[in-house]
Interface confidence: medium
């Protein structure tokens, strides 16, 4: 047989070798395909529900204007000349639709070095016959289940028109020291061959490599951090490392609206002050690191105050609500 | 772009429990820090808690202390708020926010938390 391959819409014209180019002719075309139980038979004269979706020609060609994906099949002609020399015509056709260009949507801006990370979703719909999906990093394949890299893959076929949409999760554990900015495509391939790949423009997220740094400190003076009502609190935040980066402070886990600054001084404390404080520091190539969180609280006099650093208050919160 | 997805709200009566998660795509999980907040038809959007850059610090409104607990799970980029001993005025729509350095930069859509009595 012949393999014809069609695009799902367009027109299809077989041809019926041997046949007389018009009438009287003795043909008969016969078709196995997703719209017949077994063998149909079509003849020359036609008419009937068939002629919308395909019929003879008056050359003997048969004709369907508008292939779709029952139509994939075999179709065979049978024709004999003016001599009574019988000729046979076997065709095998299959059917194909390009999708849209494929894209990659919830796309990363930011990976983390070292930890399994979402680089984004490749989507592609409208494909017949389905295709696939595959990544790249830096205009070379990605290897699924080699050196961190995992896909998932899902296929959806459309219950009215028959098509595909496929989609591709991929997450990868960028190395350590690698390059900072790596360049992510998705391509999709063809069911049939003889069809060029369809690419995703690229994608280019940060990797930000997580460097530990030592402890912040978080000093309190007075020690404990109780302290008599109009009394000053002085709170520094020790940072080891270098050059020194910004700190923001934190009350109650709200940020306060205050210039970065190593240390904040709380002068005539009042009932307002109260509360638990902590410092964060950020520098430019690392994460925010925490100091842990100090209770600040007044004391009445004779009163007993709290253990230093004691951990509560309520909430990372309520400031910039944007 | 950093995308925040919450999930998990629903109808639970006085005294059950709820465990609302939060869902961070776009950025280095680990880079924020997220806090819950909430709002109920007719008053402002209040905080309710927050966790840490390291998940080391917690925080809680004074309101949920001791009937909610946070957490977060750095491989799979979320946040969840167990929610226990539930009362009618817990009811609202539950936000979780991401904060970079020092202000919650982004919002999720919310999840509506409804406690009958």
């Known amino acids: 047989a012949q393999n014809i391959t069609a695009r799902i819409g367009e027109p299809l014209v077989l041809k019926c070798k041997g046949a007389p180019k018009k009438p009287p002719q003795r043909l008969e075309w016969k078709l196995n395909t997703g719209r017949t139980e077994a063998w149909k038979v079509l003849s020359p004269q036609g008419g009937g529900p068939w002629d919308s979706v395909a019929r003879v020609l008056p050359n003997g060609s048969l004709f369907l204007p508008a292939v779709g994906i029952q139509d994939e099949g075999i179709f065979r002609c049978q024709a004999m000349n003016r001599n009574g020399k019988e000729t046979k015509s076997n065709y095998r056709v299959r059917v194909y639709q390009i999708p849209g260009k494929p894209e990659i949507v919830d796309s990363a801006s930011e990976l983390t070095a070292g930890v399994p990370n979402k680089v984004g979703t490749c989507v592609s719909e409208g494909s017949y016959p389905a295709g696939t999906l595959s990544w790249h990093l830096d205009g070379k394949p990605l290897v699924p289940n080699e050196k961190g890299v995992s896909v998932k893959e899902q296929t959806r076929r459309h219950p009215e028109t028959g098509l595909f949409t496929l989609q591709s999760e991929l997450m990868v554990t960028p190395a350590r020291g690698g390059d900072p900015r790596p360049t992510f495509s998705c391509s999709f391939s063809p069911g049939l061959p003889r069809h060029r790949a369809l690419r995703t423009a690229p994608i280019q997220p940060r990797v930000w490599e997580p460097v530990p740094l030592e402890e912040v400190q978080l000093v309190v003076e007075p020690e404990g951090g109780a302290v008599a009502p109009g009394g000053t609190v002085t709170l520094t935040c020790e940072v080891p490392a270098q050059p020194s980066p910004q700190i923001h402070w934190m009350k109650d886990g709200v940020p306060l609206p205050l210039p970065p600054s190593p240390v904040l001084i709380l002068p005539e404390i009042g009932p307002q002050d109260q509360g638990t404080y902590s410092c964060v520091a950020t520098h430019s190539s690392h994460g925010p690191q925490e100091s842990r969180a100090v209770s600040i609280s007044i004391i009445e006099p004779g009163e007993e105050g709290p253990t230093a650093g004691s951990v509560g208050g309520s909430g990372l919160g309520t400031l910039a609500l944007a | 772009a950093v995308q925040l997805v919450e999930s998990g709200g629903g109808l639970v009566q006085a005294g059950g429990s709820l465990r609302l998660s939060c869902e961070v795509s776009?950025?280095?999980?680990?880079?924020?820090?997220v806090g819950w907040f909430r709002q109920a038809p007719g008053k402002e959007r209040e905080f309710a808690a927050a966790?840490?850059?390291?998940?080391?610090?917690?925080y809680y409104a004074a309101s949920v202390k001791g009937r909610f607990t946070i957490s977060r799970d750095n491989a799979k980029n979320t946040v969840y708020l167990q929610m226990n001993s539930l009362k009618p005025e817990d009811t609202a729509i539950y936000y979780c926010?991401?904060?970079?350095?020092?202000?919650?930069?982004?919002w999720g859509q919310g999840t509506q938390v409804t406690v009958s009595s």
């Open positions: 926010a991401a904060m970079l350095v020092s202000t919650y930069d982004y």
């Open positions: 776009g950025g280095a999980f680990s880079r924020y820090a």
């Open positions: 966790i840490s850059w390291s998940g080391n610090n917690t």
